[in-house]
Amino acid sequence: AGVFELQIHSFGPGPGPGAPRSPCSARLPCRLFFRVCLKPGLSEEAAESPCALGAALSARGPVYTEQPGAPAPDLPLPDGLLQVPFRDAWPGTFSFIIETWREELGDQIGGPAWSLLARVAGRRRLAAGGPWARDIQRAGAWELRFSYRARCEPPAVGTACTRLCRPRSAPSRCGPGLRPCAPLEDECEAPLVCRAGCSPEHGFCEQPGECRCLEGWTGPLCTVPVSTSSCLSPRGPSSATTGCLVPGPGPCDGNPCANGGSCSETPRSFECTCPRGFYGLRCEVSGVTCADGPCFNGGLCVGGADPDSAYICHCPPGFQGSNCEKRVDRCSLQPCRNGGLCLDLGHALRCRCRAGFAGPRCEHDLDDCAGRACANGGTCVEGGGAHRCSCALGFGGRDCRERADPCAARPCAHGGRCYAHFSGLVCACAPGYMGARCEFPVHPDGASALPAAPPGLRPGDPQRYL
């Protein structure tokens, strides 16, 4: 047993054009009240079919009189929750209808008049004991915002309100085989009431009304020992085998229900309980329409006016999935070029570009050399978002403005002396060395360790290498 609770947050004009006229006027003040109808499962029954899970009516809201010329605002609401008590287990999946009624308070003969302003319906999956679920539903130009939850009434606990809890009899622990009732640790699970007639020796249950058998026992009440002898012996055709039980594959093995449907065994086949938006033997057919509001995160729903046609959600930037339910990590696609840093701001994507690059995706390579002159005959070289000057001989520095000392780096090897020259530098080599940088030793026999000389040159001619 438990209670379904509905909290109406607002009822007023929906977004978009065509705001509805206020339901009340100075001449006809009125007040609102709400009705909720609940049905188990995901049935799309007519609004008139019985509210098998229960129904509730809210109190009347405050009297409202329209201000002339003002657009219809959110209308004043009744106080408190709508509560629908349920006596049996909470089914987990349910259909709801919420109706907004107007009570006119003018000078009607015979008392107030009632008229239906809006009706919204939907199918949802909900575990008892969970947090409040928020929802927005539209009916014509009206929008209803509400929250709902299902909670168990003590001593029932669990997602279906089927486990029972009792205050502890002993202060320290629960009875044999009984667990503490989280989150009420000071209470204990009560023994379950199994199916009537379930064998106390050979049967047990995990849900009320169930009868599960210990190994070696079978039958609906666990009173039949599992026979090792055969109940199918070779004999003539058309043999009746009443009472013969054989093991076999479970009807729901491998879960034949698609799209998250839950499977239950039936004598000849199986039955799928389909999640919101699906129907068919195996929940393989999508029955959601735009009226069900299937698009999340501000997605725009197109199509799906009749139950057999599909709908398409056009997702806003930053969301994807058939129902716009997944947030896109847009930076994972590395949209920023040239090493730019990606920032997903939710409503937009930003690229923070490295120096030398610009554009929404850092795709433009700025002309690094634009307006950058290299002095003294140097040439500008672009690259990596920064400019560089390739300086003429005798000059250096970022812009080739510094006169270079070619001898500063001590380019002459083996003690050779360096002289700056208008064309660069000249090395005067120490005895026994030769070459442009005095890098080659001269051997005593007159040969040198020079590389093979080009044709027409003598290996020992140092002047030609200066």
């Epitope: 058998c213 039958g219 009443t242 039980l245």
Partner: nanobody
Framework: EVQLVESGGGLVQPGGSLRLSCAAS????????IGWVRRAPGKGEELVAR????????RYADSVKGRFTISADTSKNTAYLQMNSLRAEDTAVYYC???????????????????SGQGTLVTVSS
């Protein structure tokens, strides 16, 4: 009068194939659940395959999954069991039976059989 008559059994080498037939009379198989039950020497019965022709529902025991295929021709009121890649452990008497799911207990699902045929022997041996 309800009758189920199996045929198609015989001796086959490992890796071979057989097709068993189950001709039903006295009821319409389209609206019933038909199963093939086997009894191997020294073992209990096991429902190896099951079909409900109304919705095309089929189920197989793990031991035969991927090798056996159950089917039904409602115009002939006949069910079939196509057995491929046969193994020595498939040797058994195979019965065709009208079956209904009964319950789950002791880690097994159980089926109640109300009518069955006389059985056909399948021997897999080299």
């Amino acid at each position: 009068e309800v009758q189920l008559v199996e045929s198609g059994g015989g001796l086959v080498q490992p890796g071979g194939s057989l097709r068993l037939s189950c001709a039903a009379s006295g009821f319409n198989i389209e609206y019933e659940s038909i199963g093939w039950v086997r009894r191997a020497p020294g073992k209990g019965e096991e429902l190896v395959a099951r079909i409900y022709p109304t919705n095309g529902y089929t189920r197989y025991a793990d031991s035969v999954k991927g090798r056996f295929t159950i089917s039904a021709d409602t115009s002939k009121n006949t069910a079939y069991l196509q057995m491929n890649s046969l193994r020595a452990e498939d040797t058994a008497v195979y019965y065709c039976a009208r079956s209904e799911y009964s319950h789950y207990s002791g880690s097994h699902h159980y089926y109640a059989l109300d009518y069955s045929g006389q059985g056909t022997l399948v021997t897999v041996s080299s």
